[in-house]
């Protein structure tokens, strides 16, 4: 699978996460940081 | 199966506003982003400006700045657009389309027609 | 604003000839482009995004290139179906689409 890094304009799309560009399957992807899920790592779990 | 259903269309008065809606299934809005994207009859293609239902914020071409807003419901999964101080140039078939989660996913269009 | 300068506005090729139409930006988009096509009284139809990324059921006969401020949409044989007019848009930083090239047989 191709990926970089999101474009600009994706900024501020994964709230708690980096946003990665997944090309081949045309979308963005969060990967959210320990602690964080959601599409956009946006509910904090414990 | 995700779908972007959008309003039917509308003649308006010019000076008037408009609102057009943008109803997702399938998927949830927060998730993604939503473009309006227009194109008058016989001209290309215009991006008008996105939305972030998450967190509420747009942002619009320089353009259309103070006379377009674009609003989000969360709770129906519904994206709206409205255009305000219509002419005729404003005349043209209004796209919603989704971005994000996945690239680039088109509603069907909404004509709207400004007429006096 | 990022403005995406598309040439030509229009053409007209015969069966078989190979197509291509250019797009400039006013800066470095980072590959961030995407290519429609659009036939009348249809929305447009994405063909490539991130410069060449042909979408599932596009024809191989369609492809992109480019880097920087320059890219390039090329039709490698012109077939009937591909009459229509053809944007491209740059997603880097919002959006902006080219002016359309219309795309005819001769």
């Known amino acids: 699978v191709s990926i970089t890094k999101c474009n600009s304009d994706m900024n501020g799309y994964c709230l708690h996460g980096q946003c990665i560009y997944l090309v081949d399957m045309s979308q963005n992807y969060c990967r959210c940081e320990v602690g964080y899920t959601g599409v956009r790592c946006e509910h904090f779990y414990l | 199966q995700d779908q972007l259903v959008q309003s039917g269309a509308e003649v308006k008065k010019p000076g008037a506003s408009v609102k057009v809606s943008c109803k997702a299934s399938?998927?949830?809005?927060?998730?993604?982003?939503i473009q309006w994207v227009r194109q008058a009859p016989g001209q290309g293609l215009e991006w008008m400006g996105r939305?972030?239902?998450?967190?509420?914020?747009?942002k619009y071409r320089e353009k259309f700045e103070g006379r377009v807003t674009i609003t989000a419901d969360t709770s129906t999964n519904t994206a709206y657009m409205e255009l305000s101080s219509l002419r005729s140039e404003d005349t043209a078939v209004y796209y919603c389309?989704?971005?994000?989660?996945?690239?680039?996913?088109w509603g069907q269009g909404t004509l709207v027609t400004v007429s006096s | 604003d990022i403005q995406m300068t598309q040439s030509p506005s229009s053409l007209s090729a015969s069966v078989g000839d190979r197509v291509t139409i250019t797009c400039k930006a006013s800066?470095?988009?980072?590959?961030?482009i995407a290519w429609y096509q659009q036939k009348p009284g249809q929305a447009p139809r994405l063909l490539i995004q991130?410069?060449?990324t042909l979408q599932p059921g596009v024809p191989s006969r369609f492809s992109g290139s480019g880097s920087g401020t320059d890219y390039t949409f090329t039709i490698s044989s012109l077939q009937p179906e591909d009459i229509a007019t053809y944007y491209c848009?740059?997603?880097?930083?919002?959006?902006?689409f080219g002016g359309g090239t219309k795309v005819e047989i001769k």
């Open positions: 848009l740059q997603y880097d930083n919002l959006r902006t």
């Open positions: 939305i972030d239902p998450l967190r509420g914020n747009t």
């Open positions: 399938g998927f949830n809005i927060k998730d993604t982003y």
């Open positions: 389309v989704r971005s994000g989660t996945l690239f680039d996913f």
């Open positions: 991130y410069t060449s």
């Open positions: 800066q470095d988009i980072h590959k961030y």
